[in-house]
């Protein structure tokens, strides 16, 4: 039961993650208009990953594309990029995770098919929070080397009254929304890893022992504990015996030192 | 038709407050913010305040801030212009408008006066 | 606050003549975000409200003659008049729409000459 509770709540976990991760690529507050410590303006600008806006205080709102490729930063591409390839990844292993589930039967699939593609939707997963946890974190930081920048020339001008305001942006919603869903998307590929673990069979029949019924005589292979990493066939370890009524998840558990004759 | 009209004006003595209203009809007045502006006798337009739309920000000139206080009622599309401790200076003709694309003021109504006398 | 200065305070013109009005602010009102300037020009007939002209400093408003034109960027900018007729007559104001507190020129003042 456990197994299960844990490889639903990595699912679920990553989906949220993964719609999260979707949902801050397509925002577009990326980054927003430092309000403080500037003049009140009566235009407040933001920008995203594949346009920039401008709301007026009048509710007027006008958004842009980004109509270039070779003319946006290297940095910003990087982020797509690295967003784009972090959704990829999410997708596939939300795709492959959804047959993996233990609670969805799909014909004959054994339980180590089963584990070996909760193994993989679970690196899939970590690996798309990776890359959305870093794309936010280098679009981060290129704010804060910006921001810093801006603020040392705020005010450039010709000398005398006439001033230029230079605009600096902070921190959007979207790197908040990114930071989170990237974690989130980690936190259930960490669990779909360990839910793998459990899901996997064990070459050890040390269950054959437990209830051995007089009269009759049982086969028992040896073989000491391997720790299956959910990839590899695991066909041959077919159950010889079992001797009591038992839920899937029981029949999954560790061998303890007791397990042993 | 967009329309705009204030009401509420007249004479005061200083001191004094006076509540400016303006009916707002022919936009959707919720999705709009609106402002006040102001002409003395015979001078140039003041911007007095501002109202955004949504979470209705509001913008003062620094000779009426703390004053001056404006609100929006949407389901009633109206403006208020609640003025208190009026002073001589603040006799003009009160314009209620609507602002645009640009922040620019593309719609005035007739304007309401008020003046401030002992 | 922003300075608006508009200059001249006042003209004499002939129908048919072409006009410039001056308008200096401050600071720039280029907003960076979407390279538009927030400046406003307003036309004024006596006993009458303002009526918006040009707004986004070059945008004419619909309805608004095509003989009316702004231009400039930045802190410089200059309404035009390419053809001054007698309905003309008013009173021109520059507008800061950039930044609070939303500042006007003192006007230019139009005249049949």
């Known amino acids: 039961m456990a197994v299960t509770a844990c490889q639903g709540l990595g699912f679920v976990v990553s989906l949220i993650g993964i719609a999260g991760i979707i949902a801050a690529t397509c925002m577009d507050q990326w980054s927003t208009q430092d309000l403080y410590n500037n003049p009140v303006t009566a235009v407040f600008n933001y920008q995203g990953l594949w346009r920039s806006c401008v709301r007026e205080s009048s509710g007027f709102t006008e958004c842009r594309g980004y109509f270039t490729l070779l003319g946006l930063p290297a940095m910003l591409q990087a982020v797509r990029a690295l967003m784009i390839v972090g959704i990829v990844l999410g997708a596939i292993g939300l795709l492959v995770s959804i047959f993996a589930l233990k609670c969805i039967r799909i014909g004959s699939m054994e339980d180590s098919a089963k584990a070996n593609m909760t193994l993989t939707s679970g690196i899939m997963f970590i690996v798309s929070g990776l890359c959305a946890i870093a794309g936010v974190s280098v679009f981060a930081n290129m704010l804060v080397t910006n921001f810093w920048m801006s603020t040392a020339n705020m005010y450039t001008g010709m000398g005398g009254m006439v001033q230029t305001v230079q605009t600096r942006y902070t921190f959007g919603a979207a790197l908040f929304v990114g930071w989170v869903a990237g974690g989130l998307t980690l936190i259930g590929g960490v669990m779909m890893c360990i839910a793998c673990r459990g899901l996997a069979p064990e070459e050890t029949n040390y269950k054959a022992v437990s209830y051995h019924a007089s009269g009759h005589s049982v086969a028992y292979k040896p073989g000491g504990f391997k720790a299956s990493t959910g990839f590899g066939s695991n066909t041959k370890n077919k159950k010889i015996y079992d001797g009591g009524a038992r839920t899937e998840d029981e029949v999954q558990s560790y061998p303890s030192k007791h397990d042993y004759v | 038709e967009v329309q705009l009209v204030e009401s509420g004006g007249g004479l005061v003595k200083p001191g004094g407050s006076l509540r400016l209203s303006c009916a707002a009809s022919?936009?959707?007045?919720?999705?709009?913010?609106v402002s006040w502006v102001r002409q003395a006798p015979g001078k140039g337009l003041e911007w007095v305040s501002t109202?955004?739309?949504?979470?209705?920000?509001?913008y003062y000139a620094d000779s009426v801030k703390g004053r001056f206080t404006i609100s929006r009622d949407n389901a009633k599309n109206s403006l208020y212009l609640q003025m208190n401790s009026l002073r001589a200076e603040d006799t003009a003709v009160y314009y209620c408008?609507?602002?645009?694309?640009?922040?620019?003021?593309?719609?005035w109504g007739q304007g309401t006066s008020v003046t401030v006398s002992s | 606050d922003i300075v608006m200065t508009q200059s001249p305070s006042s003209l004499s013109v002939s129908p048919g003549e072409r006009v410039t009005i001056s308008c200096k602010s401050s600071?720039?009102?280029?907003?960076?975000?979407?390279?538009?300037?927030?400046l406003t020009w307003y036309q004024q007939k006596p006993g009458q409200p303002p009526k918006l002209l040009i707004y986004?400093?070059?945008t004419r408003e619909s309805g608004v003659p095509d003989r009316f034109s702004g231009s400039g960027s930045g802190t410089d900018f200059t309404l035009t008049i390419s053809s001054f007729q007698a309905e003309d007559v008013a009173v021109y104001y520059c507008?800061?729409?950039?930044?609070?507190?939303?500042?006007f020129g003192a006007g230019t003042k139009l005249e049949l000459k």
């Open positions: 022919g936009f959707t007045f919720s999705n709009s913010a």
């Open positions: 507008q800061n729409d950039y930044f609070y507190p939303l500042t």
């Open positions: 600071q720039s009102l280029l907003n960076s975000g979407n390279q538009k300037n927030y």
């Open positions: 986004w400093a070059s």
């Open positions: 109202i955004t739309s949504g979470v209705s920000y509001t």
């Open positions: 408008t609507r602002q645009f694309k640009g922040n620019a003021l593309d719609y």
